[in-house]
């Protein structure tokens, strides 16, 4: 299953990055799982994951750094709290969980660049 | 003549970006000209240029946003005062001016990403 995502995204100076993950659904899925994985120095780590029913909101865990909304076959993902050290390739993984058959799609990744802001001068 | 430069550079939160432009000199040039060009939306504009004698400092114009140092066939370029709207592909062009023959080399460009900082809160 094909998954499309932008090649490059710049995080805002507040450490927030947003991108769209779009998948070409071969069937009529009712339950979809979206996982964001970060690849840096050939290490892959899971950033966040959410399962949602088509037409409903994405619900990430309360302590997740991700939020998202879905619209048809598009998922709008936002990652917050990013620092310069979090710069890396963020891969969107989409699973059509239900009904069978199960489909898996993995995007090519979005390179997110993060620049730490300069500290503001102390107010005297 | 081959010119190498990094594919991507992030400007600091102060709007400063630095990168190395390295050329494979076919001869013993004594006078070299380095030009930085910016390509965005298929428009190419000249950012800055400097001619230098091998072993001497690069001297850009006083009002230039560029500074630089040279070491052998490497030129260390710094561009300052960058804003988000200056994001683009910065191409390094190297000309071996003297002695003849004249050589020209153009790099593939360095994509410089610039993020404007959040304004600091007013001190009351």
């Amino acid at each position: 299953m094909h998954v499309a995502q932008p090649a490059v995204v710049l995080a805002s100076s507040r450490g927030i990055a947003s991108f769209v993950c779009e998948y070409a659904s071969p069937g009529k899925a009712t339950e979809v799982r979206v996982t964001v994985l970060r690849q840096a120095d050939s290490q892959v780590t899971e950033v966040c994951a959410a399962t949602y029913m088509m037409g409903n909101e994405l619900t990430f865990l309360d302590d997740s750094i991700c939020t998202g909304t879905s619209s048809g076959n598009q998922v709008n993902l936002t990652i917050q709290g990013l620092r310069a050290m979090d710069t890396g390739l963020y891969i969107c993984k989409v699973e059509l969980m239900y009904p069978p058959p199960y489909y898996l799609g993995i995007g090519n990744g979005t390179q997110i660049y993060v620049i730490d802001p300069e500290p503001c001068p102390d107010s005297d | 003549m081959h010119v190498a430069q990094p594919a991507v550079v992030l400007a600091s939160s102060r709007g400063i970006a630095s990168f190395v432009c390295e050329y494979a000199s076919p001869g013993k040039a004594t006078e070299v000209r380095v030009t930085v060009l910016r390509q965005a939306d298929s428009q190419v504009t000249e950012v800055c240029a400097a001619t230098y004698m091998m072993g001497n400092e690069l001297t850009f114009l006083d009002d230039s946003i560029c500074t630089g140092t040279s070491s052998g066939n490497q030129v260390n370029l710094t561009i300052q005062g960058l804003r988000a709207m200056d994001t683009g592909l910065y191409i390094c062009k190297v000309e071996l001016m003297y002695p003849p023959p004249y050589y020209l080399g153009i790099g593939n460009g360095t994509q410089i990403y610039v993020i404007d900082p959040e304004p600091c809160p007013d001190s009351d």
Epitope: L37, V44, T45, E46, A49, L61, I91, L104, I106 | -
Partner: nanobody, 111 residues
Framework: QVQLQESGGGLVQPGGSLRLSCAAS????????MTWLRQAPGKGLEWVST???????SYADSVKGRFAISRDNAKNTLYLQLNSLEIEDTGMYYC?????RGQGTQVTVSS
């Protein structure tokens, strides 16, 4: 090298039980959402169960109440306990996490 290796499959009679294991090497299993999938002969893949990094679990309706997913963080191993097995549960069972999927273990339910 990141690898997932399933084991524990076999031939079992209807109503019987099996415990499938998935040993992870090259990454910390507890940091990932881990999923069990299965593929019946001549059919497409089917999602069975998922345990997320926080430990919460979910199951396909067809296995709810019969199968149980768990993991042992110390052993870096994922498990799937299969109870009250039915002939329709026959197939290749795979574990998956991150960008990796194992080679699978065969479960055959037959009288």
């Amino acid at each position: 090298q990141v690898q997932l290796q399933e084991s524990g499959g076999g031939l079992v009679q209807p109503g019987g039980s099996l415990r499938l294991s998935c040993a992870a090497s090259g990454f910390t299993l507890s940091s990932y959402s881990m999923t069990w999938l299965r593929q019946a002969p001549g059919k497409g893949l089917e999602w069975v169960s998922t345990i997320n990094s926080g430990g919460s679990t979910s199951y396909a309706d067809s296995v709810k109440g019969r199968f149980a997913i768990s993991r042992d963080n110390a052993k870096n191993t994922l498990y799937l306990q299969l109870n009250s097995l039915e002939i329709e549960d026959t197939g290749m069972y795979y574990c998956q996490g991150g960008l990796t999927r194992g080679q699978g273990t065969q479960v055959t339910v037959s009288s």
